[in-house]
């Protein structure tokens, strides 16, 4: 199946690469603006220059385009622990990341929060912390894994998800009331 093309894609496909069709005159192909610039005025005729202007501070275009406005630079979400890796320039958006010994958890496709990598106290590092993944820990005997932290089996009750990991300890606890919460 042929993918459905939007009006802009249809118009652009009539012109060779790097050019776009004039919005008022479909017999004219204008040269697209370079990254870091935006379309101020369409070319007046065939073979004539497109009027492109450089993006103002706080805005950018990262590829050749015929946008009427530059895109606003992203701001790093400080409240989510993000830090600026590189500043926005006219041809590149802000790059945000996390500090050393932190990993990213994505709440949505483009929004992430920084969390500290687990140190695997009371356990051993099975897999090291990576950009988008916390350390994977293996816990020592008498401890169970809870949100990637090794927690003492004394915090485990019979009805909870830790019971299999703490089975010997649980069976040794007799006559204690189990509310199912910690």
């Amino acid at each position: 199946l042929v993918p459905h093309l939007g009006d802009r894609e249809k118009r652009d496909s009539v012109c060779p690469q790097g050019k776009y069709i004039h919005p008022q005159n479909n017999s004219i192909c204008c040269t697209k603006c370079h990254k870091g610039t935006y379309l101020y005025n369409d070319c007046p005729g065939p073979g004539q220059d497109t009027d492109c202007r450089e993006c103002e501070s706080g805005s950018f275009t990262a590829s050749e385009n015929h946008l009427r406005h530059c895109l606003s630079c992203s701001k790093c979400r400080k409240e989510m622990g993000q830090v600026e890796i590189s500043s926005c320039t006219v041809d590149r958006d802000t790059v945000c990341g996390c500090r050393k010994n932190q990993y990213r958890h994505y709440w949505s496709e483009n929004l992430f929060q920084c969390f500290n990598c687990s140190l695997c106290l009371n356990g051993t590092v099975h897999l090291s912390c990576q950009e988008k993944q916390n350390t994977v820990c293996t816990c020592h005997a008498g401890f169970f894994l809870r949100e990637n932290e090794c927690v003492s089996c004394s915090n485990c009750k019979k009805s909870l998800e830790c019971t299999k990991l703490c089975l010997p300890q649980i069976e040794n606890v007799k006559g204690t009331e189990d509310s199912g919460t910690t």
Epitope: Y103, H105, Y106, W107, S108, E109, F112, F115, K132, Q133, N134, R146, E147, N148, L160, E161, C162, T181, T182
Partner: nanobody, 120 residues
Framework: EVQLLESGGGLVQPGGSLRLPCAAS????????MTWVRQAPGKGLEWVSA????????YYADSVKGRFTISRDNSKNTLYLQMNSLRAEDAAVYYC?????????????RGQGTLVTVSS
């Protein structure tokens, strides 16, 4: 078995308010970050808000910041979403979800959802 049951949805006028509770069972509720996500008709899942296990840290999508408040009552194993100043674009099925930190977005453990309709 993890179970999450959302309720509180319904029809509300623009500018109105709703409170959505989510009852959790089958896991130690207070240990986990929880989140609300929503899905408008014909659209994908959109993250709305998240809260840490203790309730001390809360985060919001830009689209709901200042209007929605996430909270939890660990003694009742219940998560809440207070929605104020509702807009037509807030109409969606709202789901609560248990968060697995790292990577993401992952909303594998989520409830059946509750429908919020915003219309005059």
């Amino acid at each position: 078995e993890v179970q999450l049951l959302e309720s509180g949805g319904g029809l509300v006028q623009p500018g109105g308010s709703l409170r959505l509770p989510c009852a959790a069972s089958g896991f130690t509720f207070e240990w986990y970050w929880m989140t609300w996500v929503r899905q408008a008709p014909g659209k994908g899942l959109e993250w709305v808000s998240a809260i840490s296990g203790s309730g001390g840290s809360t985060y919001y999508a830009d689209s709901v910041k200042g209007r929605f408040t996430i909270s939890r009552d660990n003694s009742k194993n219940t998560l809440y979403l207070q929605m104020n100043s509702l807009r037509a674009e807030d109409a969606a099925v709202y789901y609560c979800a248990k968060v697995k930190l790292g990577g993401g977005p992952n909303f594998g453990y989520r409830g059946q959802g509750t429908l919020v309709t915003v219309s005059s």
